[in-house]
């Protein structure tokens, strides 16, 4: 097809409106002024341009703003944001939380795309810190975003943001991240009663210290084995057989299936065989009767 560059008579766009929906790509290119487009960006998202038509509109904006779009344009990109590459976004300076929300809304319900990740990175770097409002926004759209932050970055997460977190959003968090998140969750949920508290705190227990596990064992929580297996080994080791039995309740029988895996394996090695036998599960590997247990780590610290 011959390249058509001249705008047909009477088709020059005087404003961005629904009539442009019928323009072919070459007509949009020839008949829509880039400056007009930039000043009326708020109208673009109200018109369901097709994906291919958006290519033309993006091309026009790229020519008008080769150094990157101004925030007044970015805020109204709407579906045009889906056309942006991470390289495009790295040219932006996004400082308004409203702009961030507007663009995250476009991607709502989808996985975090490279574009969104770049946008968030640019926004946070531009702000210089992860303030409460930013985190509330990010965790509302992407609760799993918490696990993509370093422990240092997580330290600035306000406890109130923890309420938006669902159990599956912590699946990718490592123990160092849970160490930071757990105290925040404990604080966020502190006014809940026992059973409700346990339901909420359960996902964060991978960061819980021994004394908190001991306290939970006194509350008939019936922790499931999946949660128990995610606990910090160093937090589980000091627990007595009686405490683990109380902590797990009816789920204690599951220890047998997990006796070769951490933290159960390491915990068994620290218990007296006599005590393990009281569970009636046939757990083996405990300290034989009559043996004295020396805490060598304490001796090393003294020498």
């Amino acid at each position: 097809e011959v390249e058509k560059t001249a705008c047909p008579s009477g088709k020059k766009a005087r404003e961005i409106d629904e009539s442009l929906i019928f323009y072919k790509k070459w007509e949009l290119e020839a008949c829509v002024d880039a400056a007009l487009l930039a000043t009326q960006m708020d109208r673009v998202n109200a018109i369901p341009f097709t994906y291919e038509q958006l290519d033309v509109l993006k091309h026009k904006l790229d020519e008008l703003y080769p150094q990157g779009y101004p925030e007044s344009v970015i805020q109204h990109l709407g579906y045009l944001f889906l056309k942006m590459s991470p390289e495009d976004i790295r040219k932006w300076n996004v400082t308004s939380l409203e702009t961030l929300k507007a663009l995250l809304e476009v991607n709502k319900g989808h996985e975090m795309s490279p574009q969104v990740a770049t946008l968030i990175d640019r926004f946070v770097k531009g702000r210089g810190q992860l303030d409460k409002d930013t985190l509330d926004t990010l965790t509302a759209f992407y609760p799993g975003y918490l696990c993509s932050l370093s422990p240092e970055e997580l330290s600035s997460v306000p406890p109130s943001s923890i309420w938006a977190v669902r159990p599956q959003d912590l699946d990718t968090c490592d123990p160092r991240q849970l160490d930071v998140l757990y105290p925040k969750a404990r604080l966020a949920f502190q006014n809940m009663n026992g059973s409700e508290y346990f339901v909420k705190i359960q996902s964060f227990l991978g960061g819980a210290p021994t004394e908190d596990l001991k306290a939970l064992s006194q509350q008939n929580v019936s922790m499931d084995l999946a949660t128990f297996m995610k606990l910090r080994t160093d937090a589980v080791l000091p627990l007595t057989v009686a405490e683990v039995q109380k902590l797990l309740g009816p789920h204690v029988e599951g220890l047998k299936a997990e006796e070769r895996h951490r933290p159960v394996r390491d915990w068994i090695l620290r218990q007296r065989q006599d005590d393990l036998d009281t569970l009636g599960l046939g757990l083996q590997g405990g300290i034989p009767n009559g043996y004295l247990v020396l805490d060598l780590s304490m001796q090393e610290a003294l020498s």
Partner: antibody, heavy 120, light 107 residues
Framework: QVQLVQSGAEVKKPGASVKVSCKAS????????MHWVRQAPGQGLEWMGW????????IYYEKFQGRVTMTVDKSISTAYMELSRLRSDDTAVYYC?????????????WGQGTLVTVSS | DIVMTQSPDSLAVSLGERATINCKAS??????VAWYQQKPGQSPKLLIY???TRHTGVPDRFTGSGSGTDFTLTISSLQAEDVAVYFC?????????FGAGTKLEIK
């Protein structure tokens, strides 16, 4: 789940008007563009236009311009398509359909269709 | 307007055999093509979009391919419930246009 329930079959005389309704449920009515598509007996599908229930903005295919009017009643989550000055070749099944992602205008959900017969 | 030309008009294929339906666009539409299945007395149902992406719940015996102006819908092993009319649609630009349909029957 998303449901689009249309009004019953109509028989009209040439020159008359017909108004077809489409009641939506299972989603936020004002969120998606509502399109109308028709299918003449044994024929293909023909797009007629759309209305955005939130803004009442409409776009009509030029073939129907001046004869078609699309409206909504947000209070009852219902869209309407009125076609005037009916001719015998307007005999068709008329469908309402919604598009979830406006930049990808594929028809995700359809009504069951309303047969409009134009006969003298 | 972009014209979508479907071929063949009708097609008879044995159960378990492959069925192939073609659609040609009058202009380059990139990959902005969808395919629909319409069973007798029913409204159309979305099968494929972006030329080759299966819609949720669509069996993997349905495959779409092509880009630019030439597109194909393939049913790898025809089942009795696949008897229907199949339509292609372009959504590269408005007005949205459809092919005239291909009637698929069992031989």
């Amino acid at each position: 789940q998303v449901q689009l329930v249309q009004s019953g079959a109509e028989v009209k005389k040439p020159g008359a008007s017909v108004k077809v309704s489409c009641k939506a449920s299972g989603y936020t009515f004002t969120s998606y563009w509502m399109h109308w598509v028709r299918q003449a007996p044994g024929q293909g599908l023909e797009w007629m236009g759309w209305i955005h229930p939130n803004s009442d903005n409409t776009i009509y295919y030029e073939k129907f311009q001046g004869r078609v009017t699309m409206t909504v009643d947000k209070s009852i989550s219902t869209a309407y398509m009125e076609l005037s000055r009916l001719r015998s070749d307007d005999t068709a099944v008329y469908y309402c359909a919604i598009i979830i992602t406006p930049v990808v205008p594929k028809f995700d959900y359809w009504g069951q269709g309303t047969l409009v017969t134009v006969s003298s | 307007d972009i014209v979508m030309t479907q071929s063949p008009d009708s097609l008879a294929v044995s159960l378990g055999e492959r069925a192939t339906i073609n659609c040609k666009a009058s202009h380059d539409v990139g990959q902005s093509v969808a395919w629909y299945q319409q069973k007798p007395g029913q409204s159309p149902k979305l099968l494929i979009y972006w030329a080759s992406t299966r819609h949720t719940g669509v069996p993997d015996r349905f495959t779409g391919s092509g880009s630019g102006t030439d597109f194909t819908l393939t049913i790898s092993s025809l089942q009795a419930e696949d008897v229907a009319v199949y339509f292609c649609q372009q959504y590269s630009s408005y007005p949205l246009t459809f092919g005239a349909g291909t009637k698929l029957e069992i031989k």
